[in-house]
């Protein structure tokens, strides 16, 4: 398979040609989040379906005959990497938490009369820490959607309330699949609340909606996109473990006119270190939280992964010995909170420099749409990425 | 579809040893918990051993703990029943049968490996000197 | 080990008559969990035992929907709402609560 970095760029980078299509506001996910959900089902689907979700862990240029030509023995094999991964990613996430709000949550809710394999809930938990819930859909469907909502509440600090609305669960509902990832970060190097200022932020070239705009002068990676006509930025976490990223166009409606112009491959290329170099910056960047709950099957289905959301065509074999079952619902939500919050500069570290427009300094003045990813630097998986469009 | 085939059955004199097979094909073998049920002729059923999917759990009825061993090869996809030191009360239709899976949070029970379907033929295992 | 008994220990019926079995445990087969770890299983003549039933009430997979089980704790019934003529064989209840699993000894429900 290939490596997480590059599988979450690929991922982030189509769902969000995918959502982009019936969104026109912020768009705001976790590809490994979704990756993470996307094994566990993978870990327990066999024949087709399995093949549909392993198609995401390899990149075209692996030729889907050779794939296609091996024995369902092998496949489980080859699938036996891709849950590794995930188990390696997941016990370095979980070492971050001293420093960082970050959780990747992933919870299966199951109908509690329902047989599943005792092989498919320890491999579930091993690779992916997460476990199956029961729940009555048979006899009290709105209450089993209560529960859900309400433990989805209490992993995301109360951020995502009513994940599941009224009548989005019934009685012959066998599995939900949600999946939620919760961000709360520090730079790192703080934003000084006192140079926050309102200012306006242009959702296009005619309308403006007033934002908290952060401010700071410093050394950053940067680059310069000629062709595009945009910039990049990243922006460090504490310790260095995370990044965001910044991609700004320079004109107020120039992130629609790009965004045919990237793909997957160019973004690792123009945030890897060769590419950028260090420079002073004056970076203006709204304070803003996003929080973004999205219904994946009919996304997913889009892009190929059909066959684990279709009542007829699912092969849920590897989680249980009966017939189907599948995943009715797979929601995913994710929150991130840009706050000013980082750590205070000490008196002999870093050199800031106050905000001026003297000449070699770069200013990055994020006052209208742009993209933004944040990168787990160690493994080069995207744990968030976004449009930020709409205040 | 899920077949069983058992075999390995015949006769034999107590207190000597015999070694049950069961071949399975149809389905991810290493996946599933794996069962011996027996029935002496003319009686009822009676539960024997259970394995689990990977070979790391094992329990077995009263009356043959230490005598019966149940083990598996995944690879081969054969479970197995070694039977030691065996009296006329063994006398018996082995079947072997594939446990079906369990509910969510069975934390508690002994054993998540609650329910055996399908079944397989039964091999005849007959203890007489 | 947990005794289980059922009766009656025949039951002749006439076809499209319903027929009823009871299963009685010496213990509460009721988990923490809510379920109830009971099973029936029904072995035709000459062939290998089926599950009919398991968590007391739940049909398995193929089973006609005029098998259903009831009953909680000790006490459980196995209820066939009209009874067809390859319905014929012995019904075991089983509880699997605890291993050993032990099973009743068995109802045999011939036509009548």
């Known amino acids: 398979m290939d490596s997480l970095g590059a599988v979450s760029t690929r991922l982030g980078f189509d769902l969000f040609k995918e959502l982009k299509k019936t969104n026109d506001g912020n768009i705001f996910f976790s590809p490994v989040g979704i990756l993470t959900a996307i094994g566990m089902v993978l870990l327990g689907t066999r024949g087709a379906t399995a093949s549909q979700l392993e198609e995401v862990f390899h990149s075209e240029k692996e030729t889907k005959s050779s794939r296609i030509k091996a024995e369902e023995k092998e496949v489980i094999e080859n699938t036996e990497a891709v849950h590794q991964q995930f188990q390696k990613f997941l016990t370095e996430i979980s070492k971050l938490t001293n420093d960082y709000e970050l959780n990747i949550t992933n919870r299966l809710f199951g109908e509690k009369t329902y047989l599943f394999l005792q092989k498919y809930l320890d491999y579930v938990e091993k690779y992916y820490h997460a476990s199956l819930e029961p729940v009555d859909f048979v006899n009290a469907a709105d209450e089993s959607r209560k529960k859900i909502n309400s433990w989805v509440e209490s992993k995301t600090n109360e951020k995502i309330k009513d994940l599941f609305p009224d009548g989005s669960i019934s009685s012959s509902t066998k599995l939900v699949l949600v999946n939620m990832v919760y961000f709360k970060g520090q730079w790192d190097r703080e934003f000084k609340k006192e140079n926050t200022k309102e200012e306006k932020f242009w959702m296009n070239k005619s309308t403006s909606k007033s934002v908290q705009m952060m401010t700071q002068s410093h050394s950053f990676s940067f680059t310069f996109l000629e062709d595009l006509q945009a910039k990049i930025l990243g922006i460090p976490y504490k310790n260095n473990d995370l990044s965001m990223f910044v991609l700004l166009p320079n004109d107020i409606d120039g992130l629609e006119k790009i965004i045919d112009k990237i793909s997957p491959e160019k973004l690792v290329e123009w945030t890897s270190p060769g590419h950028m170099e260090e420079r002073k910056v004056n970076l203006h960047l709204p304070r803003f939280e996003v929080e973004d709950g999205y219904d994946l099957e009919a996304v997913l289905a889009a892009m190929g992964m059909g066959d684990a959301f279709s009542e007829h065509k699912a092969d849920y074999s590897g989680m249980s010995s009966g017939s189907g079952l599948y995943a009715q619902k797979f929601l995913h939500s994710s929150f991130v909170a840009v706050t000013e919050e980082g750590t205070e500069a000490a008196a002999a570290t870093g050199i800031g420099f106050t905000v001026t427009s003297a000449p070699g300094h770069e200013n990055v003045h994020c006052n209208h749409p742009f993209l933004f990813f944040i990168r787990h630097n160690e493994s080069n998986s995207i744990l968030f990425f976004g449009r930020f469009s709409s205040p | 579809q899920v077949q069983l085939q058992e075999s390995g059955g015949g006769v034999v004199q107590p207190g000597r040893s015999l070694r049950l097979s069961c071949a399975a094909s149809?389905?991810?073998?290493?996946?599933?918990?794996m069962h011996w049920v027996r029935q002496a002729p003319g009686k009822g059923l009676e539960w024997v051993a259970v394995?689990?999917?990977?070979?790391?759990?094992?329990y077995y009825a009263d009356s043959v703990k230490g005598r019966f061993t149940i083990s598996r090869d995944n690879s081969k996809n054969t479970l197995y029943l070694q039977m030691n030191s065996l009296r006329a009360e063994d006398t018996a239709v082995y079947y072997c049968?594939?446990?079906?899976?369990?509910?969510?949070?069975?934390?508690?029970?002994?054993?998540?490996?609650?329910?055996?379907?399908?079944w397989g033929q039964g091999t005849l295992v007959t203890v007489s000197s | 080990d947990v005794v289980m008994t059922q009766s009656p220990l025949s039951l002749p019926v006439t076809p499209g008559e319903p027929a009823s079995i009871s299963c009685r445990s010496r213990q509460s087969l009721l988990h923490s969990n809510g379920h109830n770890y009971l099973g029936w299983y029904l072995q035709k003549p000459g062939q290998s035992p089926q599950l009919l039933i398991y968590l007391a009430s739940i049909r398995a997979s193929g089973i006609p929907d005029r098998f259903s089980g009831s009953g909680s704790g000790t006490d459980f019934t196995l209820k066939i709402s009209r009874v067809e003529a390859e319905d014929v064989g012995v019904y075991y209840c089983m509880q699997a609560l605890q291993t050993p699993y032990t099973f009743g000894q068995g109802t045999k429900l011939e036509i009548k």
């Open positions: 149809g389905f991810t073998f290493s996946s599933y918990g």
């Open positions: 394995i689990s999917y990977d070979g790391s759990n094992k």
């Open positions: 049968a594939r446990d079906l899976g369990a509910v969510i949070a069975v934390a508690g029970t002994s054993t998540p490996y609650n329910w055996f379907d399908p």
